[in-house]
C-alpha cells in the first residue's frame, strides 16, 4: 500500500524555539516515521533537518539548527515505513516574520504601597530578537486578588514601579512583550502574585518638583513629619530599557545627601543634557521610608519650562487673566517654541477650597466670583507633547480683590 504524504504542517516559532506539527494522513498505518528536509533561498539542494528525522510522533523541534532568521526557508516532509511517501512541501517562510514573542520573565518586589516589576525577555540572549533587544516594550494587566477588577498599563520598560497600592493586599499581574517596530505582540506571562507589606512607619516623600533658579536646579518635596533627613538619587532614564539588566546604579546628588530641609539646591552642571529619574527618601535616624515616586527630569525642557507670568484684570464677578512669557534672570522673556497648556488654580483668600481651570489660550476668564472678595491665583505650564509630559512649577500666588457689583461689562 502506498504511504500518503503527511498534511497540514504548521510551523510555530516562539522566541528561539522552532516547532513543527503535522497531521498523519493515514491513522490506520502503524509504525510510521516522518522526516523533514529544508532548503535555503537560492539553493537547489535539500538538506536533512536535524532534530526532525525519523520522528514517530507528529511534532518535532528544530531549534538547534542555526538559521539566519531573516532568510526565507522552505520545508518538506514525507512519511516512511518500508517505503516512503511523496514529499509534501510547506509554503516557504521567513523565521523572523513568523516568530512570536514568548512570555517574558517577571520578578516582583513588594513595598507597603508599591510593587516593583522587573521584566526580562523569556529567552536570554535570543538569536531571534538579537537586533531588537532595546526595542521591547511591555504591557501588563494588574488586579487585586480579592476583586479581580483589571487595570491595564501600556508601554512600560524592563523596570516599572506601580504606586498608590494598599498595604497588606495581594495583587496579581501578567505581562506581555511587544516589538512595535515589527508589529509583534507577544503572549502573556503566567500570572504572578505578591502581597504588599504592612504599612511602613515613615511614608515616602511626595510631590517632588524641580525648578530652575539662576544656574541651579531647586528640588522640592513635601513631607509629613519634621526633624527628618533626606537623600536624593538619580538614574539615567534609558537604563530602565536595558533588557536583562536588573542592577540599577542609582547615584547620590552630593548636595542632596542628608539634607534637613524639604528642598535642596544643586548646580545645573551636575547633569549633562538628558532625561533622568529622581527619587527621594526620608529618615528619622532610626527608621527609613521607602523611596518616593520616581519623577522624570528632562534637562532640556526643565531649563526652559518656567512658570508663566500673568496679569489680572479684576471685575466684580470674574477675573480676566492674561498670560505672558516667563522671564529669565535679567528680565528677558523666554521663547517657548512648543505648545503649552496652562493650569490656573484660584481660591478665596479666606478659604482652602481650590478651583482649577485648564486652558490652551493665553487669555482666560475666571468666572463666578463674588464682588469685593479677595481671590488668589497661581498658574503653571504643561507641555502638550505626551512623550515629554512636563510641567513647570507653579508661579507665586497673586491675590486681587474683585470690584463692587455691576462692573462686569
Amino acid at each position: 500500500k502506498n504511504l500518503k504524504s503527511p498534511q497540514k504542517v504548521e510551523v510555530d516559532i516562539i522566541d528561539d524555539n522552532f516547532i513543527l506539527r503535522w497531521n498523519r494522513s493515514d491513522e490506520s498505518v502503524g509504525n510510521v516515521t516522518f522526516s523533514f528536509d529544508y532548503q535555503k533561498t537560492g539553493m537547489d539542494n535539500w538538506i536533512k533537518l536535524s532534530g526532525c528525522q525519523n520522528i514517530t510522533s507528529t511534532k518535532c523541534n528544530f531549534s538547534s539548527l542555526k538559521l539566519n532568521v531573516y532568510e526565507e526557508i522552505k520545508l518538506r516532509i514525507r512519511a516512511e515505513k518500508e517505503n516512503t511517501s511523496s514529499w509534501y512541501e510547506v509554503d516557504s517562510f521567513t523565521p523572523f516574520r513568523k516568530a512570536q514573542i514568548g512570555p517574558p520573565e517577571v520578578h516582583l518586589e513588594a513595598e507597603d504601597k508599591a510593587i516593583v516589576i522587573h521584566i526580562s525577555p523569556g529567552t536570554k540572549d535570543s538569536v531571534m530578537w538579537a537586533l531588537d533587544g532595546l526595542s521591547f516594550t511591555y504591557s501588563l494587566v494588574i488586579w487585586k486578588n480579592s476583586s479581580g477588577v483589571e487595570e491595564r498599563i501600556e508601554n512600560i520598560y524592563s523596570r516599572h514601579k506601580i504606586y498608590k497600592l494598599s498595604p497588606e493586599t495581594t495583587y496579581c499581574l501578567k505581562v506581555k512583550a511587544a516589538l512595535l517596530t515589527s508589529w509583534k505582540i507577544g503572549v502573556y506571562s503566567p500570572v504572578h502574585c505578591i502581597k504588599t507589606t504592612v504599612e511602613n512607619e515613615l511614608p515616602p516623600p511626595e510631590n517632588i518638583e524641580v525648578s530652575v533658579q539662576n544656574q541651579n536646579y531647586v528640588l522640592k518635596w513635601d513631607y509629613t513629619y519634621a526633624n527628618m533627613t533626606f537623600q536624593v538619587q538619580w538614574l539615567h532614564a534609558f537604563l530602565k530599557r536595558n533588557p536583562g539588566n536588573h542592577l540599577y546604579k542609582w547615584k547620590q546628588i552630593p548636595d542632596c545627601e542628608n539634607v534637613k530641609t524639604t528642598q535642596c539646591v544643586f548646580p545645573q552642571n551636575v547633569f549633562q543634557k538628558g532625561i533622568y529619574l529622581l527619587r527621594v527618601q526620608a529618615s528619622d535616624g532610626n527608621n527609613t521610608s521607602f523611596w518616593s515616586e520616581e519623577i522624570k527630569f528632562d534637562t532640556e525642557i526643565q531649563a526652559f519650562l518656567l512658570p508663566p507670568v500673568f496679569n489680572i484684570r479684576s471685575l466684580s464677578d470674574s477675573f480676566h487673566i492674561y498670560i505672558g512669557a516667563p522671564k529669565q534672570s535679567g528680565n528677558t522673556p523666554v521663547i517657548q517654541d512648543y505648545p503649552l497648556i496652562y493650569e490656573i488654580i484660584f481660591w478665596e483668600n479666606t478659604s482652602n477650597a481650590e478651583r482649577k481651570i485648564i486652558e490652551k489660550k493665553t487669555d482666560v476668564t475666571v468666572p463666578n466670583l463674588k464682588p469685593l472678595t479677595v481671590y488668589c491665583v497661581k498658574a503653571r505650564a504643561h507641555t502638550m507633547d505626551e512623550k515629554l509630559n512636563k510641567s513647570s512649577v507653579f508661579s507665586d500666588a497673586v491675590c486681587e480683590k474683585t470690584k463692587p457689583g455691576n462692573t462686569s461689562k
Epitope: 516582583l108 518586589e109 507597603d112 539588566n245 536588573h246 542592577l247
Partner: antibody
C-alpha cells in the same frame, strides 16, 4: 565562567594597614557593584561596604567609615579594600562579592584571612 | 542600621526533617531579603533572593517567604549536604546587614 580570586593571607601588626585585592574574570566589573564582607573566627558575616568600579563611587558601613578605602582598577578587573588602624578584633576572613541583578551578592571570592597580631 | 534577628541560632536535626528558620527585621524592608548557605571553610552561597526567588540550580526543597519584617527559609526535607550555617541579609538600605546565622547540626 564568573570567578573572583583574592590575594593571599596576611599577618599584620596592630595599628598597621592591610590591602586585600580581588580580581574578577568572566564578567565586566564595570557593570556590577563589588562588595566586601568579613567574618571573624566563629562569627557571622559583616558587610563592610561596596564600590561601583565604573565611577569609583563607594558606600561604607558607618562602623568602618574613616578606616576603610575601596578602589578599583578596571583595566585589570581588580578591586581593592584597604583597612587601616588595625586592631586585634579586625582579625577575620575578608570576602569580596559581586553585586549583581536585584543587588544580590551572587558570586564570592575564596576569602582572605587577615590576622592582626603583635 | 537595620537589625536582623534569626531564630533559632542552633538547630539539631536529622536527615528528612522539615526545617524552618525565621528572620525578623527591625524595620520594614519590603521583600529585599536574601538567604545564604555557608559550609565550614567555604564562601557563602546564595539560595534565595527577593524573599522568595530561588537561585537557578538550588534544589526545590529550599523555599523562602515573607515580607515587611518577617521572613522564613524552609528546607522541606533535609539532606546530608544541607548541614551548614544559614544567614539572612537585607538589601533594602545601606548599610546592608546580616542575621547572626542559624547553624544546622546533625542530631
Amino acid at each position: 565562567q564568573v570567578q573572583l580570586v583574592q590575594s593571599g593571607a596576611e599577618v599584620v601588626k596592630p595599628g598597621a594597614s592591610v590591602k586585600v585585592s580581588c580580581k574578577g574574570s568572566g564578567f565586566n566589573i564595570k557593570d556590577y557593584y563589588m562588595h566586601w564582607v568579613r567574618q571573624a573566627p566563629g562569627q557571622g558575616l559583616e558587610w563592610i561596604g561596596r564600590i561601583d568600579p565604573e565611577d569609583a563611587e563607594t558606600k561604607y558601613a558607618p562602623k568602618f567609615q574613616g578606616r576603610v578605602t575601596m578602589t578599583a582598577d578596571t583595566s585589570t578587573s581588580t578591586v581593592y579594600m584597604e583597612l587601616s588602624s588595625l586592631r586585634s578584633e579586625d582579625t577575620a576572613v575578608y570576602y569580596c562579592a559581586r553585586g549583581g541583578n536585584f543587588y544580590v551578592m551572587d558570586y564570592w571570592g575564596q576569602g582572605t584571612l587577615v590576622t592582626v597580631s603583635s | 542600621d537595620i537589625q536582623l534577628t534569626q531564630s533559632p541560632s542552633f538547630l539539631s536535626t536529622s536527615v528528612g526533617d522539615r526545617v524552618t528558620i525565621t528572620c525578623k527585621a527591625s524595620q520594614n524592608v519590603g521583600t529585599n531579603v536574601v538567604w545564604y548557605q555557608q559550609k565550614p571553610g567555604k564562601s557563602p552561597k546564595v539560595l534565595i533572593y527577593s524573599a522568595s526567588y530561588r537561585v537557578s540550580g538550588v534544589p526545590s526543597r529550599f523555599s523562602g517567604s515573607g515580607s515587611g519584617t518577617e521572613f522564613t527559609l524552609i528546607i522541606s526535607s533535609l539532606q546530608p549536604e544541607d548541614f551548614a550555617t544559614y544567614y539572612c541579609q537585607q538589601k533594602n538600605n545601606y548599610p546592608y546587614t546580616f542575621g547572626q546565622g542559624t547553624k544546622l547540626e546533625i542530631k
